[in-house]
C-alpha cells in the first residue's frame, strides 16, 4: 500500500527530484572598486563582496575574480542593481550651444562567459541617458531575468563608468543568481 | 526493485523534499495610506492590501500591521515596486539662481526586522534624485533580490515621502516575497 | 527500514512532488515591431522572439500571437523590461510658455487575458514621465512580480508607444515567466 502511494508521484517526475535547499545560489554586494586596467573596448567588470553582511554563496555556487561560477546546468534567475551617482552632465550646455547632442549615459550589462565560446554573451542590459538639471544626480538600474546556463559558465556585471558606481551601501548595488 | 528506483533519488536529497505549492508566498498591493505617526529619523512604512484583487498571502505567510511575517527559515526572493508622483522640485530654479543644489529625491527601502536584533536591517534600497523640468512627474522604483531569512523575521517597505506614493492602482505599487 | 526513511518526507507533502526541470518557463526577446491595427483605447501589444538567441519556451509554455499561454495553474513569477528611446519631448518649451504641462510619458503594462472573463487584467504597470533636457533620451522600465494564474490564461506586454521601443538588442527588451 505504501508502494502505491509513491508510484503516482514517481511517474510524474521526469528529472531527479531535488531539495530546494541545496540549489546553487548567490547574492553578492558592492565593494569599492580600486583603479585597475580594463580590457580595451569592453565595459569594466565590477568585483563584489561574497561573504560579509548580506552577501553569500552556497551549494557550489562560487565567486572568484569578478565572476560567479555556475556549478550545474539549468535555468537560473539572474539579477543585479547598480546605483550610479555623479555630477551634472554637459548635455544641457551642449544643447544650448545648438550642437547635436549625444547624451551622457549609464549602462549595466550582465554578461555570460563560456570558455568554449570566444565571445562573451550579453544576457541583460539596462541603459539610460543622463541629462540632469541639478548639480548632483543618483539613480539605480535594475535588471533580472531567467536564462538557461551550462555548468562552467561564468557571470559578471559590467558598467559603462566604474567611477560612478555607488559603493557605500550593500543594499544599493548588488548581483545575484539562483537555480530555479 | 521499486526500492532501487527510489534509492538514487533519495541519496541526492540533503533536505526534506517539499511540494512547491505549499511554500510561503505573498503579493501585496497598494492601498491609500492614512496619516500616521512616523518614527523619528526613519522613513515611514507603507501598509498594504493582502487579500483583495491581485493580493494574496498563502502557506503561513501572514501580513499584519505593515509587516510580512516570515513563517519558516530559508532563502526568499523579495521584491517591491513603488510608483511616485509629484510636482516639480525646486532644483532647476535653485540652479538658475546659482546656489548649490541638493536635489529632491525619492527612496524605497525593503527592511528586515528581527525581534532579537535591536536595529532593522536594510536589505534593498532604490534611491533616485528628482530634478524634473516638467511641472508634474511620475516614475517607479523597482527592487528585487534573494535573502536568507529566519522564521519570525518581519519585512516592510519604507519610503522617503509617503505623500508622493501613487496609491491609485494595484499594478503600480506592490510588495511580495516567496520562499525559493 | 527504507520505508521509514521515506515516510516523514511523504507526510510533509500536501501537493504532488514534481521535478523543477519540467516546470513551464519562457524568456522572450524583442523583435522589430511591424505596424499593425491596434485596439481602440488599448495600448498596443508587443510581439516577441521565442526560440532564437536567448529566447526559449519549455515544458508546455507556448508563445503564440503576442501571448504567452499558461499551461497549468499555479504561482508564476512574471517579468519584463522594455527599453524606450526617443527625441526630446516638448514639455520644457510648454513650461516656458507658462501653460500647464501634462508631460510625455512611457508606460509598460503586463496584462492577463482570461477567456472566460470579458476584461483583461493589468497585473503590472511601470509608467514614467519623460521630460528630458537633452535632445535624445533612452531608458528602461523593468517590472517583475508573482501572480496566481490559471491554466489557459494568456499574458502579453502592452506599451504606450510601440514606435519608441528599442528593438535593436535582445538584452534590452524582454519578457518572461516561470512557474514557481
Amino acid at each position: 500500500l505504501k508502494g502505491q502511494e509513491f508510484a503516482p508521484s514517481h511517474q510524474q517526475v521526469y528529472a531527479p527530484l531535488r531539495a530546494d535547499g541545496d540549489k546553487p545560489r548567490a547574492h553578492l554586494t558592492v565593494v569599492r572598486q580600486t583603479p585597475t586596467q580594463h580590457f580595451k573596448n569592453q565595459f569594466p567588470a565590477l568585483h563584489w563582496e561574497h561573504e560579509l553582511g548580506l552577501a553569500f554563496t552556497k551549494n557550489r555556487m562560487n565567486y572568484t575574480n569578478k565572476f560567479l561560477l555556475i556549478p550545474e546546468s539549468g535555468d537560473y534567475f539572474i539579477y543585479s542593481q547598480v546605483t550610479f551617482r555623479g555630477m551634472t552632465s554637459e548635455c544641457s550646455e551642449i544643447r544650448q550651444a545648438g550642437r547635436p547632442n549625444k547624451p551622457d549615459s549609464i549602462t549595466v550589462v550582465i554578461t555570460k562567459v563560456t570558455d568554449s565560446y570566444p565571445e562573451p554573451t550579453q544576457l541583460l542590459m539596462g541603459t539610460k541617458s543622463v541629462c540632469e538639471v541639478g548639480s548632483n544626480w543618483f539613480q539605480p538600474i535594475y535588471l533580472g531575468a531567467m536564462f538557461s546556463l551550462q555548468e562552467g559558465d561564468k557571470l559578471m556585471v559590467n558598467v559603462s563608468d566604474i567611477s560612478l558606481v555607488d559603493y557605500t551601501k550593500e543594499d544599493k548595488t548588488f548581483f545575484g543568481a539562483f537555480l530555479l | 526493485l521499486k526500492g532501487q528506483e527510489f534509492a538514487p533519488s533519495h541519496q541526492q536529497v540533503y533536505a526534506p523534499l517539499r511540494a512547491d505549492g505549499d511554500k510561503p508566498r505573498a503579493h501585496l498591493t497598494v492601498v491609500r495610506q492614512t496619516p500616521t505617526q512616523h518614527f523619528k529619523n526613519q522613513f515611514p512604512a507603507l501598509h498594504w492590501e493582502h487579500e483583495l484583487g491581485l493580493a494574496f498571502t498563502k502557506n503561513r505567510m501572514n501580513y499584519t500591521n505593515k509587516f510580512l511575517l516570515i513563517p519558516e527559515s530559508g532563502d526568499y526572493f523579495i521584491y517591491s515596486q513603488v510608483t511616485f508622483r509629484g510636482m516639480t522640485s525646486e532644483c532647476s530654479e535653485i540652479r538658475q539662481a546659482g546656489r548649490p543644489n541638493k536635489p529632491d529625491s525619492i527612496t524605497v527601502v525593503i527592511t528586515k526586522v528581527t525581534d532579537s536584533y535591536p536595529e532593522p536591517t536594510q536589505l534593498l534600497m532604490g534611491t533616485k534624485s528628482v530634478c524634473e523640468v516638467g511641472s508634474n512627474w511620475f516614475q517607479p522604483i523597482y527592487l528585487g533580490a534573494m535573502f536568507s531569512l529566519q522564521e519570525g523575521d518581519k519585512l516592510m517597505v519604507n519610503v522617503s515621502d509617503i505623500s508622493l506614493v501613487d496609491y491609485t492602482k494595484e499594478d503600480k505599487t506592490f510588495f511580495g516575497a516567496f520562499l525559493l | 527500514l527504507k520505508g521509514q526513511e521515506f515516510a516523514p518526507s511523504h507526510q510533509q507533502v500536501y501537493a504532488p512532488l514534481r521535478a523543477d526541470g519540467d516546470k513551464p518557463r519562457a524568456h522572450l526577446t524583442v523583435v522589430r515591431q511591424t505596424p499593425t491595427q491596434h485596439f481602440k483605447n488599448q495600448f498596443p501589444a508587443l510581439h516577441w522572439e521565442h526560440e532564437l538567441g536567448l529566447a526559449f519556451t519549455k515544458n508546455r509554455m507556448n508563445y503564440t500571437n503576442k501571448f504567452l499561454l499558461i499551461p497549468e495553474s499555479g504561482d508564476y513569477f512574471i517579468y519584463s523590461q522594455v527599453t524606450f528611446r526617443g527625441m526630446t519631448s516638448e514639455c520644457s518649451e510648454i513650461r516656458q510658455a507658462g501653460r500647464p504641462n501634462k508631460p510625455d510619458s512611457i508606460t509598460v503594462v503586463i496584462t492577463k487575458v482570461t477567456d472566460s472573463y470579458p476584461e483583461p487584467t493589468q497585473l503590472l504597470m511601470g509608467t514614467k514621465s519623460v521630460c528630458e533636457v537633452g535632445s535624445n533620451w533612452f531608458q528602461p522600465i523593468y517590472l517583475g512580480a508573482m501572480f496566481s494564474l490559471q491554466e489557459g490564461d494568456k499574458l502579453m506586454v502592452n506599451v504606450s508607444d510601440i514606435s519608441l521601443v528599442d528593438y535593436t538588442k535582445e538584452d534590452k527588451t524582454f519578457f518572461g515567466a516561470f512557474l514557481l
Epitope: 569599492r32 572598486q33 580600486t34 583603479p35 585597475t36 586596467q37 580594463h38 569594466p44 551617482r85 555623479g86 555630477m87 554637459e90 548639480s135 548632483n136 563608468d161 566604474i162 567611477s163 560612478l164 558606481v165 555607488d166 559603493y167 557605500t168 551601501k169 | 548649490p100 541638493k102 | -
Partner: antibody
Framework: EVQLVESGAEVKNPGASVKVSCKAS????????LHWVRQAPGQGLEWMGW????????NYAQKFQGRVTMTRDTSISTAYMELSRLRSDDTAVYYC???????????WGQGTMVTVSS | DIVMTQSPSSLSASVGDRVTITCRAS??????LNWYQQQPGKAPKFLIY???RLQSGVPSRFSGSGSGTDFTLTINSLQPEDFATYFC?????????FGPGTKVEIK
C-alpha cells in the same frame, strides 16, 4: 601597481602661470576621474577640481573658476593642471589623485611644490 | 559649500591607546564620508570610505562610524606608525571639502 608621478618643483613670480603634469600608470587612465588637491604649508587639504580623462570634461571648485585649467593627453596617460595669475597665497604642494569612484582619492601623486615669490 | 569640522584639532596619546576623532558636516552627507592619514612630508593615504568601510590593506584597528552629519574615526590600540594627521572629506557634493585635520602626537 597604480602610480601617479608629478613634475618637479616650480618657483614663479606673482601674476605668472604654472603648469603641473601628472603621469599615470598601472590602470586605465581614461576610466577614472583625476583630481587636483593642494596643501599650503602647514595647512589643510583643498580640492581644486577634477578632469574626466575619457571626455576631457572638467569640474572646478568655484574658488578657482577662471584661473585653473585642467587638460589631459590620453596618448601618454598624462593630466595637466595650469593655474594662472598666481599670488603668494597659491604657494602650496599640488597633488594629483585618482579614485575608484569620482568622489574620493585612492592614490596620490608625490606632490609638486609651487612657490610664488617675487 | 559643505563645511567640514573636526575635533580635537590635536591630541596626545600613547602606543596601545584607543583614539577617537570626530568629524561634523554642515549638512547631511549621508554616508559619503572618507578618512585619510597623512605623515609629515608625505601624500595623504586613503583609510576609510562610505563612513565605515575599510579600504583594502588598511589594518583592522581602524574603524569608522556615523551617517548624516556626525562621524567618528576610531583607532584601537594605537601603533607607532599611526602618529600622523587625519583628515575627513565629504564626497556628497561638489566642491568636495576636507576637514581641517586632527594631529595625533606621541604623549
Amino acid at each position: 601597481e597604480v602610480q601617479l608621478v608629478e613634475s618637479g618643483a616650480e618657483v614663479k613670480n606673482p601674476g605668472a602661470s604654472v603648469k603641473v603634469s601628472c603621469k599615470a600608470s598601472g590602470y586605465t587612465f581614461t576610466g577614472y576621474y583625476l583630481h587636483w588637491v593642494r596643501q599650503a604649508p602647514g595647512q589643510g587639504l583643498e580640492w581644486m577640481g577634477w578632469i574626466k580623462p575619457k571626455s576631457g570634461g572638467t569640474n572646478y571648485a568655484q574658488k578657482f573658476q577662471g584661473r585653473v585649467t585642467m587638460t589631459r593627453d590620453t596618448s601618454i596617460s598624462t593630466a595637466y593642471m595650469e593655474l594662472s595669475r598666481l599670488r603668494s597665497d597659491d604657494t602650496a604642494v599640488y597633488y594629483c589623485a585618482v579614485g575608484g569612484s569620482y568622489d574620493a582619492f585612492d592614490i596620490w601623486g608625490q606632490g609638486t611644490m609651487v612657490t610664488v615669490s617675487s | 559649500d559643505i563645511v567640514m569640522t573636526q575635533s580635537p584639532s590635536s591630541l596626545s596619546a600613547s602606543v596601545g591607546d584607543r583614539v577617537t576623532i570626530t568629524c561634523r558636516a554642515s549638512q547631511s552627507i549621508s554616508s559619503y564620508l572618507n578618512w585619510y592619514q597623512q605623515q609629515p612630508g608625505k601624500a595623504p593615504k586613503f583609510l576609510i570610505y562610505g563612513a565605515s568601510r575599510l579600504q583594502s590593506g588598511v589594518p583592522s584597528r581602524f574603524s569608522g562610524s556615523g551617517s548624516g552629519t556626525d562621524f567618528t574615526l576610531t583607532i584601537n590600540s594605537l601603533q607607532p606608525e599611526d602618529f600622523a594627521t587625519y583628515f575627513c572629506q565629504q564626497g556628497y557634493s561638489s566642491p568636495f571639502t576636507f576637514g581641517p585635520g586632527t594631529k595625533v602626537e606621541i604623549k
